[in-house]
């Protein structure tokens, strides 16, 4: 019933049906910061721990503009990329290129997205067209996930679920064009 998965000629790589295309990785004005995150207490022995929270994961920060067709976001967004091998927090180097990666000979721990957030961005379009907005889904944090030989790549999707929250109160809207005025960018995590 749905379309088949398909990679198109445009600037997006198309995921499977039912997922949204992520914005293309156009890293204009790219600022990259790197930090080790999600560390816990050091394990007694690197191969004996069963607590994933004891492993640390690398989060790279990228700043880019969101584009859609001929439009570009008024401001850049900052997103995380989960990177690298997971190892005990105390053994991970603090920066890329320093120290050695800790590579476990035991179970495979992968650094994958833990939580996502949606950010609303105002798009600036040529020709003075109507104001438009887009919501982009960005990684909010990364985690170490233990992968056994029974896991497959679909584990890496592992999208977080959000706790139900009551809706914010609605403000009365006398005019229809609040998208123009509403430049607020929303960063609620889930």
């Amino acid at each position: 019933q749905g379309w088949q998965a398909f990679k198109n000629d445009a600037t997006e790589i198309i995921p499977e049906l039912g997922e949204y295309p992520e914005p293309p990785p156009e890293l204009e004005n790219n600022k990259t910061m790197n930090r080790a995150e999600n560390g816990g207490r050091p394990p007694h022995h690197p191969f004996e721990t069963k607590d994933v929270s004891e492993y640390s994961c690398r989060e790279l920060h990228f700043t880019r503009y969101v584009t859609d067709g001929p439009c570009r976001s008024a401001k850049p967004v900052t997103e995380l990329v989960c990177s690298g091998q997971c190892g005990p927090a105390r053994l991970l180097p603090n920066a890329i290129g320093r120290g050695k990666w800790w590579r476990p000979s035991g179970p495979d721990f992968r650094c994958i997205p833990d939580r996502y957030r949606a950010q609303r961005v105002q798009l600036l379009c040529p020709g003075g067209e109507a104001p438009r907005a887009r919501k982009v889904r960005l990684v909010a944090s990364c985690k170490c996930k233990r992968l056994t030989r029974f896991h497959n790549q679909s584990e890496l999707k592992d999208f977080g679920t959000e706790a139900a929250r009551p809706q914010k109160g609605r403000k009365p809207r006398p005019r229809a064009r609040s998208a123009k005025a509403n430049q607020a960018e929303l960063e609620n995590a889930y």
Partner: antibody
């Protein structure tokens, strides 16, 4: 898998109101824009408006301004469209749709038939 | 409101045919045009946006072109599942408007 499931058909009298629901699954409703589009029997598509469930921001087509209200319950990932002061020309299939933008309709519900008849 | 005029309103074609549907805007809409496919009793499906960008998983036989006021949806080789009604939509200026539709029928 993104799915939008709408409430069942309604028959209303002129002057009454109708409230159509749209249950979204596959992602949190507040992370997208919710749209409503209608289609009169044998006719084309007509955009009614969009809402941003995250902050309750709405944009209505001028034709429906003052008669339509779009709301959401983010705890149940359900969108609602209420149309008041119904007239016979409001007889149509009402579709909810969702999208990551305010201007295109990425995924659609199955439609809800609303019949306005005295 | 910007008017979107589609032509033809209906056409008959055979499997394997190349089909072209046109949409004319009453004023310049740049490339802010989307195309949808609708089958009887079903909801529409997004095919093309920004005049020429295919939506998720849409087969490559569907292509869109145009800018300004004249837009085209082309199906390079019509398949049995392509018999449906096609609508263009502009999103250059509020409120968003659709064309009247083009019904593609089996010859």
């Amino acid at each position: 898998q993104v799915q939008l499931v709408q409430s069942g058909a309604e028959v209303k009298k002129p002057g009454a109101s109708v409230k159509v629901s749209c249950k979204v699954s596959g992602f949190p409703i507040k992370h997208h824009f919710q749209h409503w589009v209608r289609q009169a029997p044998g006719k084309g598509l007509e955009w009614m408006g969009w809402s941003d469930p995250e902050i309750g921001d709405t944009e209505y087509a001028s034709k429906f301004q003052g008669r339509v209200t779009m709301t959401e319950d983010t705890s149940t990932d359900t969108a609602y469209m209420e149309l008041s002061s119904l007239r016979s020309e409001d007889t149509a299939v009402y579709y909810c749709a969702t999208g990551d933008t305010t201007y295109k309709f990425d995924f659609w519900g199955q439609g809800t038939t609303v019949t306005v008849s005295s | 409101d910007i008017q979107m005029t589609q032509s033809p309103s209906s056409l008959s074609a055979s499997v394997g045919d190349r089909v072209t549907i046109t949409c004319k805007a009453s004023q310049d809409v740049h490339t802010a045009v989307a195309w949808y496919q609708q089958k009887p009793g079903k909801a529409p499906k997004l095919l093309i946006y920004w005049a020429s960008t295919r939506w998720t998983g849409v087969p490559s036989r569907f292509s869109g072109s145009g800018s300004g006021t004249d837009f085209t949806l082309t199906i390079s080789s019509l398949q049995p599942e392509d018999f449906a009604t096609y609508y263009c939509q502009q999103y250059s200026d509020y409120h968003w408007t659709f064309g009247g539709g083009t019904k593609v029928e089996i010859k």
